[in-house]
Interface confidence: low
Amino acid sequence: MRTEAQVPALQPPEPGLEGAMGHRTLVLPWVLLTLCVTAGTPEVWVQVRMEATELSSFTIRCGFLGSGSISLVTVSWGGPNGAGGTTLAVLHPERGIRQWAPARQARWETQSSISLILEGSGASSPCANTTFCCKFASFPEGSWEACGSLPPSSDPGLSAPPTPAPILRADLAGILGVSGVLLFGCVYLLHLLRRHKHRPAPRLQPSRTSPQAPRARAWAPSQASQAALHVPYATINTSCRPATLDTAHPHGGPSWWASLPTHAAHRPQGPAAWASTPIPARGSFVSVENGLYAQAGERPPHTGPGLTLFPDPRGPRAMEGPLGVR
C-alpha cells in the first residue's frame, strides 16, 4: 500500500458558452482570450508517493504538459529551487542525469515526465510534510515549477487524497518567452472586446469535467481536485534534510554544468558523472545514483522502475542517509 499526494496540473479554464448563442461573434474572441490567458503557461504536475515500509522511500513524479521542448528538469525539496530548496536531481535530455543524496533512480519516464526516488529513514529521511518541487525549463515557454507534498497526516499504507497545493511559477524567462505569435490575436481580442463591451460577456468557469490533457502521458494522475495558485511552500524541519546535501560540490561538476542557465546553476553537493547519452528509451534510463558514479564509462546503470532508499550508494556521492529505525 502506498500513500500518495498528487498535485494535478492546473487546467486552463473553459469558456462558458451560456448566453453566447446569440453572439456567435464572441466565440472567436473568447477562444483568443483563452489562448492569451493560457499561452506560455504550460502545466506541470507533481505526484509524491511514499512507500509503506520501515525504510520508507519516496517516489516523486513530475510531468510537463507544455508544447515546447524540455531543456532541463530540476527536482528539489524544501521549496523551489533557488528559493531555499535543495536540489535533488537535474535531468538534461542530452547530457544525462545527475542526482544527489538522498535522491536515487532519477529517470525520464517519457520525453516530458520524470520520476525520482528518495531513500529515506531515520535522521536523513524526508518529513511527511516535505515539499518537493519540479522545475521544467523549456523552449519557448521558459521555466515552470510545481510543488507537492504528502498530506501532513499521511501514514504509510493509508491512501491519501490528492493535495491541491501546487505552486506554478513562471520565471521571467517564461514570461518573456511567451510565444509572440498570439500577440496580434490578443490585440485583436481587445479590439473586439471594446467593440462589444455593451454586450454581456460569458463567464469563464473552471472545468468540472475531466480535464483535458494537452499531451498524452505515460500515466495520468487523477484530476480529483483543481490546483490552486500561490499556496505557500511548506517549511521543513532541518532534521528532515540529509546532511549530505549541505556540502558544496568540491569538483565543480562537468564542464557543461557551468554553462547551464543560471536557474539551473544551483550546484548540488556531491559529484556524479554525467551520462552523455540522449534521452534513453523507456526501460533503459541512465541513472546516476546518489554518488556512486565513477568515470562516465565505468557505470552503465540503465535503470528501470524501482524504489530506492536514502543510503543506496550511488556513485560518487552515495551517502544518503541511513535507514534508521523510526
Partner: antibody, heavy 114, light 107 residues
Framework: QVQLKESGPGLVAPSQSLSITCTVS????????VNWIRQPPGKGLEWLGV???????DYNSALKSRLSISKDNSKSQVFLKMNSLQTDDTARYFC????????WGQGTAVTVSS | NIVMTQSPKSMSMSVGERVTLNCTAS??????VSWYQQKPEQSPKLLIY???NRYTGVPDRFTGSGSATDFTLTISSVQAEDLGDYHC?????????FGSGTKLEIE
C-alpha cells in the same frame, strides 16, 4: 525490523566459484540498494559492489571481472557470485543496506583452501 | 581509488576519557564519510553518516566532524562497551573505500 543474513558454503577450493545469498527482511529490495563488503581475517573492510533497488549494479573495479551481483526481489534475496577464488579471497563476507551501510548482516566466513 | 587512512592504528584509553579518532581521505570526499563500530566477533554497526549525523540509537557521546579530506570521530567519555575496531568509510566515489581501522582498547 531490518535484518540481513548471509549464507555461504564456508569452504571453497581455489579456482572455484563462490556463491553467497543475503536474505533480507524489514525492507524491500525494490527500494534499497544492497552492498557486499568483505573483511579478511584481522584486516580492514573492502567494498565489493552494490545492487540498487532498480537492479543496476556497481562493482569495485579491481574485482569487477570476477564479480556478479543479482537479486530476487520477490524472495528478498541478493546474490553474490565470485569466480576464480584464490586464497587471498578468504574473508568474512557481509551484505549491508544503503550507501551509508546502515545495517549489516552478521557475515559469513569463507575460506579458500584446497 | 580514494584511500582512507586512519590514525592511530590502536589506542588504549580509560573509562571516562575523551577519545579522538582520525581519518584522512586521499582526495576530497565532501561530507560522504561514515564511521562504523565493530566489536569483536560482530559485524560493523553504523555510528555516524554524512560526516556528522549520528545514526539512530547511537549514544550522543559519539560525535563526527570534519570536511573534504580530514575527518574525526570523537567519543566524549569513553565507556567499557566502546571497545572494538572503528572504521571510517567514504561513499563519495566508486569504489567505496574504508580505512584500515583503529582498535580501541579500554584499560
Amino acid at each position: 525490523q531490518v535484518q540481513l543474513k548471509e549464507s555461504g558454503p564456508g569452504l571453497v577450493a581455489p579456482s572455484q566459484s563462490l556463491s553467497i545469498t543475503c536474505t533480507v527482511s524489514g525492507f524491500s529490495l525494490i527500494g534499497h540498494g544492497v552492498n557486499w563488503i568483505r573483511q579478511p581475517p584481522g584486516k580492514g573492510l573492502e567494498w565489493l559492489g552494490v545492487i540498487w533497488g532498480d537492479g543496476n549494479t556497481d562493482y569495485n573495479s579491481a574485482l569487477k571481472s570476477r564479480l556478479s551481483i543479482s537479486k530476487d526481489n520477490s524472495k528478498s534475496q541478493v546474490f553474490l557470485k565470485m569466480n576464480s577464488l584464490q586464497t587471498d579471497d578468504t574473508a568474512r563476507y557481509f551484505c549491508a543496506v544503503n550507501s551509508a551501510m546502515d545495517y549489516w548482516g552478521q557475515g559469513t566466513a569463507v575460506t579458500v583452501s584446497s | 581509488n580514494i584511500v582512507m587512512t586512519q590514525s592511530p592504528k590502536s589506542m588504549s584509553m580509560s573509562v571516562g576519557e575523551r577519545v579522538t579518532l582520525n581519518c584522512t581521505a586521499s582526495e576530497n570526499v565532501a561530507s560522504f564519510v561514515s564511521w562504523y563500530q565493530q566489536k569483536p566477533e560482530q559485524s560493523p554497526k553504523l555510528l555516524i553518516y554524512g560526516t556528522s549525523n549520528r545514526y539512530t540509537g547511537v549514544p550522543d557521546r559519539f560525535t563526527g566532524s570534519g570536511s573534504a579530506t580530514d575527518f574525526t570521530l570523537t567519543i566524549s567519555s569513553v565507556q567499557a562497551e566502546d571497545l572494538g575496531d572503528y572504521h571510517c568509510g567514504q561513499s563519495y566515489n566508486y569504489p567505496f573505500t574504508f580505512g584500515s581501522g583503529t582498535k580501541l582498547e579500554i584499560e
